[in-house]
Protein backbone atom coordinates (compact mmCIF):
# COMPACT_ATOMS: atom_id res chain seq x y z
CA UNK A 1 0.00 0.00 0.00
CA UNK A 2 1.33 3.55 0.31
CA UNK A 3 3.24 4.83 2.51
CA UNK A 4 2.22 6.98 5.15
CA UNK A 5 2.95 10.40 4.95
CA UNK A 6 4.26 10.34 8.47
CA UNK A 7 7.11 7.83 7.15
CA UNK A 8 7.51 8.89 4.10
CA UNK A 9 8.38 12.75 5.78
CA UNK A 10 11.03 10.52 8.12
CA UNK A 11 12.85 8.87 5.37
CA UNK A 12 13.22 12.07 3.38
CA UNK A 13 14.75 13.64 6.63
CA UNK A 14 17.11 10.30 6.91
CA UNK A 15 18.24 10.58 3.26
CA UNK A 16 18.95 13.96 3.90
CA UNK A 17 21.53 13.67 6.59
CA UNK A 18 22.91 10.77 4.75
CA UNK A 19 23.68 13.11 2.06
CA UNK A 20 25.24 15.81 5.01
CA UNK A 21 27.44 13.28 6.61
CA UNK A 22 28.56 11.13 3.76
CA UNK A 23 30.42 14.34 1.62
CA UNK A 24 34.17 14.32 1.58
CA UNK A 25 34.29 16.73 -1.53
CA UNK A 26 31.70 19.98 -1.88
CA UNK A 27 28.29 18.57 -2.30
CA UNK A 28 27.51 18.78 -5.86
CA UNK A 29 30.69 20.20 -6.53
CA UNK A 30 29.74 23.45 -4.55
CA UNK A 31 26.97 24.08 -7.28
CA UNK A 32 24.48 27.23 -5.84
CA UNK A 33 20.33 26.81 -6.13
CA UNK A 34 18.06 29.51 -5.04
CA UNK A 35 17.56 29.75 -1.46
CA UNK A 36 13.56 29.56 -0.73
CA UNK A 37 11.24 30.72 1.41
CA UNK A 38 10.68 27.85 4.06
CA UNK A 39 6.81 27.79 3.79
CA UNK A 40 3.86 26.43 2.49
CA UNK A 41 4.62 24.81 -0.44
CA UNK A 42 8.04 24.25 0.10
CA UNK A 43 8.18 21.14 -1.29
CA UNK A 44 7.53 22.19 -5.12
CA UNK A 45 9.68 24.73 -4.20
CA UNK A 46 12.60 22.75 -2.96
CA UNK A 47 12.36 20.72 -5.81
CA UNK A 48 12.52 23.18 -8.35
CA UNK A 49 15.61 24.41 -6.79
CA UNK A 50 17.37 21.02 -6.76
CA UNK A 51 16.24 20.12 -10.20
CA UNK A 52 18.46 22.48 -11.74
CA UNK A 53 21.57 20.61 -10.82
CA UNK A 54 22.30 18.33 -12.87
CA UNK A 55 25.17 15.63 -13.04
CA UNK A 56 25.17 15.42 -9.26
CA UNK A 57 23.90 11.73 -8.43
CA UNK A 58 24.38 12.68 -4.30
CA UNK A 59 20.76 14.21 -4.57
CA UNK A 60 19.27 12.05 -6.98
CA UNK A 61 17.09 10.20 -4.60
CA UNK A 62 16.70 13.71 -2.66
CA UNK A 63 14.86 14.54 -5.99
CA UNK A 64 12.30 11.61 -6.20
CA UNK A 65 11.84 11.86 -2.86
CA UNK A 66 10.48 15.55 -2.66
CA UNK A 67 8.60 15.00 -6.24
CA UNK A 68 6.26 12.49 -3.71
CA UNK A 69 5.61 15.34 -1.77
CA UNK A 70 5.27 17.98 -4.71
CA UNK A 71 1.47 17.64 -5.98
CA UNK A 72 2.59 18.86 -9.85
CA UNK A 73 5.28 17.96 -12.12
CA UNK A 74 8.34 19.94 -11.64
CA UNK A 75 10.84 20.57 -14.55
CA UNK A 76 13.58 22.42 -14.39
CA UNK A 77 14.10 25.90 -15.26
CA UNK A 78 10.53 26.12 -13.59
CA UNK A 79 10.15 28.76 -10.59
CA UNK A 80 7.22 29.55 -7.85
CA UNK A 81 6.99 32.73 -5.89
CA UNK A 82 8.42 30.47 -2.92
CA UNK A 83 11.90 31.62 -4.23
CA UNK A 84 13.79 34.14 -2.97
CA UNK A 85 15.21 34.94 -6.44
CA UNK A 86 18.08 37.54 -5.40
CA UNK A 87 19.95 34.58 -3.10
CA UNK A 88 21.95 31.73 -4.02
CA UNK A 89 23.25 29.05 -1.69
CA UNK A 90 25.43 26.32 -2.27
CA UNK A 91 23.56 23.02 -2.01
CA UNK A 92 25.11 21.84 1.01
CA UNK A 93 23.49 24.47 2.77
CA UNK A 94 20.44 24.18 1.39
CA UNK A 95 20.32 20.63 2.34
CA UNK A 96 20.81 21.59 6.18
CA UNK A 97 18.43 23.92 6.19
CA UNK A 98 15.70 22.34 4.61
CA UNK A 99 16.76 19.31 6.94
CA UNK A 100 16.48 21.83 10.26
CA UNK A 101 12.89 23.03 8.98
CA UNK A 102 11.51 19.33 8.17
CA UNK A 103 12.75 17.55 11.51
CA UNK A 104 10.62 20.70 12.97
CA UNK A 105 7.93 20.40 10.76
CA UNK A 106 7.93 16.77 11.77
CA UNK A 107 8.05 17.32 14.98
CA UNK A 108 4.86 19.74 14.46
CA UNK A 109 3.39 16.71 12.50
CA UNK A 110 3.05 18.15 9.17
CA UNK A 111 3.24 15.50 7.08
CA UNK A 112 1.90 16.71 3.81
CA UNK B 1 8.50 35.18 37.61
CA UNK B 2 8.16 31.75 36.26
CA UNK B 3 8.45 29.25 38.53
CA UNK B 4 7.87 25.47 39.36
CA UNK B 5 8.31 23.68 42.99
CA UNK B 6 8.37 20.15 43.75
CA UNK B 7 7.12 18.64 46.83
CA UNK B 8 6.51 15.30 48.87
CA UNK B 9 9.93 13.86 48.69
CA UNK B 10 11.30 11.94 51.80
CA UNK B 11 12.13 8.45 53.16
CA UNK B 12 10.18 5.45 52.03
CA UNK B 13 10.60 1.72 52.45
CA UNK B 14 10.81 -0.36 49.45
CA UNK B 15 7.12 -1.63 47.63
CA UNK B 16 5.40 1.27 49.55
CA UNK B 17 3.86 4.34 47.83
CA UNK B 18 4.79 7.83 47.75
CA UNK B 19 3.09 11.03 45.65
CA UNK B 20 5.52 13.98 44.57
CA UNK B 21 3.77 17.78 43.19
CA UNK B 22 4.59 20.29 41.59
CA UNK B 23 3.50 23.47 41.74
CA UNK B 24 3.36 25.77 38.15
CA UNK B 25 2.90 29.64 38.53
CA UNK B 26 3.85 32.55 36.30
CA UNK B 27 2.83 31.09 33.22
CA UNK B 28 0.04 29.43 31.14
CA UNK B 29 0.04 26.15 32.83
CA UNK B 30 -2.48 24.45 30.75
CA UNK B 31 -0.84 24.94 27.44
CA UNK B 32 2.21 23.45 28.20
CA UNK B 33 3.68 19.41 28.10
CA UNK B 34 4.54 18.38 31.52
CA UNK B 35 7.83 15.89 32.63
CA UNK B 36 9.11 14.32 35.58
CA UNK B 37 12.90 13.51 35.00
CA UNK B 38 15.21 12.29 37.95
CA UNK B 39 18.81 11.93 39.02
CA UNK B 40 19.73 8.88 40.49
CA UNK B 41 22.71 10.33 43.56
CA UNK B 42 26.03 10.74 41.44
CA UNK B 43 24.19 9.52 37.99
CA UNK B 44 22.89 11.28 34.96
CA UNK B 45 19.35 12.78 33.99
CA UNK B 46 16.68 9.99 33.21
CA UNK B 47 13.66 10.90 31.68
CA UNK B 48 10.42 9.92 33.92
CA UNK B 49 7.49 10.09 31.72
CA UNK B 50 5.35 12.44 30.15
CA UNK B 51 1.96 14.18 30.26
CA UNK B 52 0.20 16.47 27.93
CA UNK B 53 -0.65 19.80 27.94
CA UNK B 54 -4.65 18.99 28.36
CA UNK B 55 -4.26 15.79 30.32
CA UNK B 56 -5.13 13.84 27.29
CA UNK B 57 -1.99 11.45 26.79
CA UNK B 58 0.67 10.01 29.48
CA UNK B 59 3.93 8.42 27.98
CA UNK B 60 6.71 6.89 30.67
CA UNK B 61 9.92 5.42 30.88
CA UNK B 62 10.18 1.69 30.45
CA UNK B 63 11.94 1.42 33.88
CA UNK B 64 8.60 3.04 35.74
CA UNK B 65 6.25 1.77 33.31
CA UNK B 66 3.28 0.64 35.55
CA UNK B 67 4.03 1.52 38.71
CA UNK B 68 4.38 5.03 38.28
CA UNK B 69 1.08 7.50 37.57
CA UNK B 70 1.21 11.18 36.00
CA UNK B 71 -1.84 13.34 36.38
CA UNK B 72 -2.63 17.13 36.22
CA UNK B 73 -5.14 19.54 37.34
CA UNK B 74 -4.97 22.60 35.45
CA UNK B 75 -7.43 24.39 37.31
CA UNK B 76 -4.78 24.41 40.23
CA UNK B 77 -1.88 24.52 37.83
CA UNK B 78 -0.55 21.54 39.40
CA UNK B 79 1.38 18.36 38.41
CA UNK B 80 1.13 14.76 40.50
CA UNK B 81 3.71 11.72 40.43
CA UNK B 82 1.97 8.93 41.62
CA UNK B 83 4.71 6.19 42.78
CA UNK B 84 4.23 2.56 43.25
CA UNK B 85 5.88 -0.32 44.49
CA UNK B 86 9.24 2.04 44.86
CA UNK B 87 12.09 -0.14 44.47
CA UNK B 88 15.77 0.93 45.64
CA UNK B 89 16.91 1.90 42.10
CA UNK B 90 14.23 4.63 42.29
CA UNK B 91 16.16 6.63 44.60
CA UNK B 92 16.93 9.93 43.06
CA UNK B 93 16.05 13.76 43.23
CA UNK B 94 12.83 14.05 41.07
CA UNK B 95 12.37 17.41 38.75
CA UNK B 96 9.51 18.53 37.23
CA UNK B 97 9.83 20.43 34.12
CA UNK B 98 7.91 21.65 31.19
CA UNK B 99 7.75 21.71 27.02
CA UNK B 100 6.33 23.39 25.12
CA UNK B 101 3.13 20.98 23.46
CA UNK B 102 3.92 19.87 19.84
CA UNK B 103 1.90 17.54 18.05
CA UNK B 104 4.65 14.67 19.02
CA UNK B 105 6.14 16.87 21.77
CA UNK B 106 9.83 16.45 20.81
CA UNK B 107 10.21 20.16 22.35
CA UNK B 108 13.38 21.28 24.67
CA UNK B 109 12.73 21.42 28.60
CA UNK B 110 13.10 25.25 28.85
CA UNK B 111 12.05 25.30 32.82
CA UNK B 112 12.93 23.12 35.43
CA UNK B 113 11.89 22.94 39.38
CA UNK B 114 14.32 22.41 41.84
CA UNK B 115 14.26 19.20 42.56
CA UNK B 116 12.65 16.95 45.64
CA UNK B 117 14.64 14.16 46.66
CA UNK B 118 13.25 10.36 47.09
CA UNK B 119 15.28 7.78 48.88
CA UNK B 120 14.21 4.20 49.07
CA UNK B 121 15.35 2.63 51.86
CA UNK B 122 13.98 -0.26 54.92
CA UNK C 1 15.76 2.15 22.43
CA UNK C 2 17.81 4.52 21.16
CA UNK C 3 21.71 5.21 23.16
CA UNK C 4 23.24 8.63 23.21
CA UNK C 5 26.92 8.48 23.71
CA UNK C 6 29.06 11.60 24.99
CA UNK C 7 32.74 11.54 26.45
CA UNK C 8 32.47 11.26 30.34
CA UNK C 9 35.00 14.23 30.41
CA UNK C 10 36.31 17.28 28.46
CA UNK C 11 39.05 19.79 30.01
CA UNK C 12 40.22 22.88 28.42
CA UNK C 13 41.94 25.75 29.98
CA UNK C 14 39.80 29.69 30.22
CA UNK C 15 39.96 31.13 26.85
CA UNK C 16 39.87 28.25 25.09
CA UNK C 17 37.18 26.39 22.92
CA UNK C 18 35.54 23.56 24.19
CA UNK C 19 33.79 20.80 22.62
CA UNK C 20 31.48 18.69 23.81
CA UNK C 21 29.98 15.16 21.80
CA UNK C 22 27.10 13.55 21.49
CA UNK C 23 26.77 10.45 19.43
CA UNK C 24 23.82 8.55 18.07
CA UNK C 25 22.45 6.56 14.81
CA UNK C 26 21.51 8.99 12.70
CA UNK C 27 21.39 11.69 15.19
CA UNK C 28 21.29 14.28 12.67
CA UNK C 29 17.04 13.43 11.66
CA UNK C 30 16.34 14.23 15.44
CA UNK C 31 16.11 17.90 17.18
CA UNK C 32 18.83 17.56 20.02
CA UNK C 33 18.72 19.66 23.15
CA UNK C 34 21.50 20.58 25.24
CA UNK C 35 21.75 21.39 28.97
CA UNK C 36 23.65 22.74 31.46
CA UNK C 37 24.19 21.65 35.46
CA UNK C 38 26.55 23.11 38.13
CA UNK C 39 26.68 21.21 41.27
CA UNK C 40 23.25 21.06 43.45
CA UNK C 41 21.51 22.93 41.02
CA UNK C 42 18.54 21.85 38.68
CA UNK C 43 19.18 21.63 34.70
CA UNK C 44 19.37 24.58 32.62
CA UNK C 45 18.79 24.97 29.02
CA UNK C 46 21.58 25.85 26.64
CA UNK C 47 21.04 24.80 23.14
CA UNK C 48 17.82 23.86 21.53
CA UNK C 49 16.68 22.58 18.28
CA UNK C 50 20.13 21.54 17.18
CA UNK C 51 21.88 25.28 17.20
CA UNK C 52 19.17 27.67 18.97
CA UNK C 53 19.91 29.48 22.02
CA UNK C 54 17.56 30.70 24.86
CA UNK C 55 18.21 34.73 24.99
CA UNK C 56 19.65 34.31 28.54
CA UNK C 57 22.15 32.15 27.19
CA UNK C 58 25.47 34.09 25.71
CA UNK C 59 26.91 33.98 22.17
CA UNK C 60 29.55 31.67 23.43
CA UNK C 61 27.30 28.76 23.23
CA UNK C 62 26.32 27.35 20.22
CA UNK C 63 25.34 23.75 18.54
CA UNK C 64 25.44 21.48 15.45
CA UNK C 65 24.18 18.30 14.73
CA UNK C 66 25.48 16.61 11.29
CA UNK C 67 25.21 12.56 10.11
CA UNK C 68 25.76 10.64 13.56
CA UNK C 69 27.24 13.57 15.53
CA UNK C 70 25.44 16.30 17.91
CA UNK C 71 28.33 18.91 19.05
CA UNK C 72 28.02 21.36 21.42
CA UNK C 73 30.80 23.98 21.36
CA UNK C 74 31.27 26.62 23.70
CA UNK C 75 34.22 29.62 22.92
CA UNK C 76 36.24 31.84 25.15
CA UNK C 77 35.26 29.14 28.16
CA UNK C 78 34.96 30.31 31.06
CA UNK C 79 35.43 28.93 35.26
CA UNK C 80 31.52 29.88 35.62
CA UNK C 81 31.02 27.41 32.45
CA UNK C 82 32.37 24.48 34.91
CA UNK C 83 29.25 21.88 34.82
CA UNK C 84 28.30 18.86 33.79
CA UNK C 85 26.26 18.74 30.07
CA UNK C 86 24.01 16.55 28.56
CA UNK C 87 22.55 16.21 25.52
CA UNK C 88 18.75 14.97 24.78
CA UNK C 89 16.63 13.97 21.80
CA UNK C 90 13.07 12.56 21.57
CA UNK C 91 12.95 9.10 19.68
CA UNK C 92 10.29 8.76 17.70
CA UNK C 93 10.29 4.68 17.60
CA UNK C 94 9.90 4.36 21.42
CA UNK C 95 7.96 7.42 21.97
CA UNK C 96 10.36 8.51 24.90
CA UNK C 97 12.65 11.37 25.45
CA UNK C 98 16.66 10.07 25.69
CA UNK C 99 19.29 11.65 27.53
CA UNK C 100 23.21 11.11 26.87
CA UNK C 101 25.38 10.10 29.88
CA UNK C 102 26.47 13.67 30.60
CA UNK C 103 29.82 15.27 29.99
CA UNK C 104 31.98 17.03 33.14
CA UNK C 105 33.41 20.64 31.66
CA UNK C 106 36.69 20.82 34.05
CA UNK C 107 37.93 24.28 33.14
CA UNK C 108 41.73 23.97 33.70
Known amino acids: GPVPPSTALRELIEELVNITQNQKAPLCNGSMVWSINLTAGMYCAALESLINVSGCSAIEKTQRMLSGFCPHKVSAGQFSSLHVRDTKIEVAQFVKDLLLHLKKLFREGQFN | QMQLVESGGGVVQPGRSLTLSCAASGFEFRTYGMHWVRQAPGKGLEWVGVIWYDGSATHYADSVKGRFTITRDNSKNTLNLQMNSLRAEDTAVYYC???????????????WGQGTMVTVSS | SYILTQPPSVSVAPGETATITCGGNLIGAKLVHWYQQKPGQAPVLVIY???DRPSRIPERFSGSNIGNTATLTISDVEAGDEADYYC???????????FGGGTKLTVL
Open chain 3, 88 to 98: QVWDYYSDTYV
Open chain 3, 49 to 51: DDS
Open chain 2, 97 to 111: ARAPQWYLTAEAFDL
